[in-house]
């Protein structure tokens, strides 16, 4: 299932880097969130629970990430013009069932003012 464009501010710039916000519904308890740049998986984070309700968080592709109760933030640093691209949050929902996949995204524009080390 493709949801299309994110209906929230997906990119937050600070200190020459960008926080990419990937939201998910509050009701979701177990999931995998992947950050895609074009068709390439840049980052992922999986939250699951075991049979005794113990929570496991794992990242196969390491990125600086931050988990809250309704979003995963991925952080990209040292921005340059090559970072300009379409970025997608690919959410796989395991729990609650049924299994569902949603894709939301937007274009990351890079402006001179957002680069970490501007040439003077």
């Amino acid at each position: 299932e493709i949801n299309g464009s994110a209906n929230y501010e997906m990119f937050i710039f600070h200190n020459g880097g960008v926080q990419i916000l990937c939201k998910y519904p509050d009701i979701v308890q177990q999931f995998k969130m992947q950050l895609l740049k074009g068709g390439q998986i840049l980052c992922d984070l999986t939250k699951t629970k075991g049979s005794g309700n113990t929570v496991s968080i794992k990242s196969l592709k390491f990125c600086h990430s931050q988990l809250s109760n309704n979003s995963v933030s991925f952080f990209l640093y040292n921005l340059d013009h090559s970072h300009a691209n379409y970025y997608f949050c690919n959410l796989s929902i395991f729990d609650p069932p049924p299994f569902k996949v949603t894709l939301t995204g937007g274009y990351l524009h890079i402006y001179e003012s957002q680069l970490c080390c501007q040439l003077k």
């Epitope: 699951t48 049979s51 005794g52 309700n53 113990t54 496991s56 729990d95 609650p96 069932p97």
Partner: antibody
């Protein structure tokens, strides 16, 4: 089709050791928590242990803690239960089970462990 | 540890009749709007089979004569019209916390 096949059961003396194995196929093994559940002859089900995707988190039933260890090899799609210092009350069929996020949705046929002198 | 208690321990019911099996937990299994309660069926010589999860959600492929209900500490598995192939032992299980524990089982036979 999901398949779980246990092996390694048999007769073992009290105080002895045994290693059970579970070969998994038909699914992406590393995506799932895995568990061991046992059933004494003519009795009910008892959870034994579980392990998360990459072996970072493990839990044990109080009855086996300190004696049993659980491990997995994702490259071999295999789950293991190392049983040390076994007792008569460990006699049971041991099932390997996949935790499908909200229930045990797949089980092996089980392997019988008999502790007797 | 949470203690799961099933009742009755066994029962014999005529084919076509309604069957009710109860499961009581020693503390509430309700969290975030979900009851962390599962039902399994185990036939002789076989491993358990998942029937119901989250107290009332039927697993794919399970006949609709099986249903689950209840919330908090009291749960029920109902078979609306007993069939010969339903002869088995039924177990409830919680996954609210570690360790997950099972009820002692209810043996169902045909009268």
């Amino acid at each position: 089709e999901v398949q779980l096949v246990e092996s390694g059961g048999g007769l073992v003396q009290p105080g002895g050791s045994l290693r059970l194995s579970c070969a998994a196929s038909g699914f992406t093994f590393s995506d799932y928590w895995m568990d061991w559940v046992r059933q004494a002859p003519g009795k009910g089900l008892e959870w034994v242990s579980n392990i998360d995707h990459d072996g970072n988190i493990i839990n044990f039933a109080p009855s086996v803690k300190g004696r049993f260890t659980i491990s997995r090899d994702n490259a071999k799609n295999s789950l293991y239960l190392q049983m040390n210092s076994v007792r008569a009350e460990d006699t049971a069929v041991y099932y390997c089970a996949r935790w499908g996020h909200y229930a045990f949705d797949s089980w092996g046929q089980g392997t019988l462990v008999t502790v007797s002198s | 540890d949470i203690v799961m208690t099933q009742s009755p321990d066994s029962l014999a019911v005529s084919a076509g009749e309604r069957v009710t099996i109860n499961c009581k937990s020693s503390q509430s299994l309700l969290s975030s709007g979900y009851n962390y309660l599962i039902w399994y069926q185990q036939k002789p010589g076989q491993p358990p089979k998942l029937l119901i999860f989250y107290a009332s959600t039927r697993q794919t492929g399970v006949p609709d004569r099986f249903s689950g209900s209840g919330s908090g500490t009291d749960f029920t598995l109902t078979i609306s019209s007993l069939q010969a192939e339903d002869v088995a032992v039924y177990y409830c299980q919680h996954h609210y916390s570690s360790p997950p524990t099972f009820g002692q089982g209810t043996k169902l036979e045909i009268k």
